[in-house]
Interface confidence: low
Amino acid sequence: QSPPGKPEIHKCRSPDKETFTCWWNPGSDGGLPTNYSLTYSKEGEKNTYECPDYKTSGPNSCFFSKQYTSIWKIYIITVNATNEMGSSTSDPLYVDVTYIVEPEPPRNLTLEVKQLKDKKTYLWVKWLPPTITDVKTGWFTMEYEIRLKSEEADEWEIHFTGHQTQFKVFDLYPGQKYLVQTRCKPDHGYWSRWGQEKSIEIPNDFTLKD
């Protein structure tokens, strides 16, 4: 039996700059029941506070609801592990909520096969920003990637589209079925997970519609 090992704050992420969650990896428990507490202070403030909500985001986590989330201050966060033999504290993590945003994936992905006048076929991929994202006001500046592959292929082909919410993919093989996904990333934030997969077959004999 021994004091607990040093916990490590794994990451903090916010879906929308309005709330955020931090997760930690416990160290060894020293073979004893061990309690974990997350405490934080804010840049320029002397007070230290305990995690407001240990439940919402699951085990070894702390959820900061709107009431506890500020984008104007840096949070200095630590996790403390305590058992009857002693205690240990994680290295502090400095968090600016603006920089930990991991949004939901883009929505409303649509795929359409189109043809130019020279009979060249292309896939027109369109999508919308995630619901929570207030892109119009500049609160978020979102960048996007799409990835696609034919059903037979092992590797995804990735295209960075910048701020565009549409992309044209040329040089696809007729008769092949293609899978497409999108993801997004705000300024200085993290990529969302890849969104729902959509598929489309490129026709062999595409006839131009008026």
Partner: antibody, heavy 118, light 112 residues
Framework: EVQLVQSGAEVKKPGSSVKVSCKAS????????IHWVRQAPGQGLEWMGE????????NYNQKFKGRVTITADKSTSTAYMELSSLRSEDTAVYYC???????????WGQGTLVTVSS | DIVMTQTPLSLSVTPGQPASISCRSS???????????LHWYLQKPGQSPQLLIY???NRFSGVPDRFSGSGSGTDFTLKISRVEAEDVGVYYC?????????FGGGTKVEIK
Amino acid sequence: EVQLVQSGAEVKKPGSSVKVSCKASGYTFTSYWIHWVRQAPGQGLEWMGEIDPSDSYTNYNQKFKGRVTITADKSTSTAYMELSSLRSEDTAVYYCARSFFTNWFAYWGQGTLVTVSS
Amino acid sequence: DIVMTQTPLSLSVTPGQPASISCRSSQSLVHSNGNTYLHWYLQKPGQSPQLLIYKVSNRFSGVPDRFSGSGSGTDFTLKISRVEAEDVGVYYCSQSTHVPFTFGGGTKVEIK
């Protein structure tokens, strides 16, 4: 104590490549971005790019795009900066720097002098 | 790219006297989130740069309170209330609101 220890000085021929390493210790490597900044002799500082070691996501200064590649090896807590197609103007001290939390540089390596000369 | 212009280029100061360095950016450094990512670094002779001030006016840990930062938008100032011998070196302002991050040309501070 946070430490960034860089590889030693290099002398390279024009047209070749150089790869500088930056070994981090004293903190959780995946929690903070690593940046690369260079300083030509007697000149100011120039930001080259950054990497998030947790997922190897990178941003580059477009000036170096295509010539610079920044990578990170989580298993050894080491970041790398490779610069290709070297020219004499690339002679500089190259620094790695760790962000305070994201994008200002609280901790710096000791610098690596790269000399490009025929 | 954002151009950061520092003045003066060099400064010779008597110990105990104040010093002031100005930094002007070619565009506003106010991020869409409302924060201003303007920072100050000092590079002492033969050393790597060190962080003094982040986000306009926040002193980094261990930085003496004789250093202060102020400003908004495009105009910023670093003040040293009483210059000491250990303050010699080149001071750089830097912005990280816009990619690529950029630095000013530097201001060399010497002791008279």
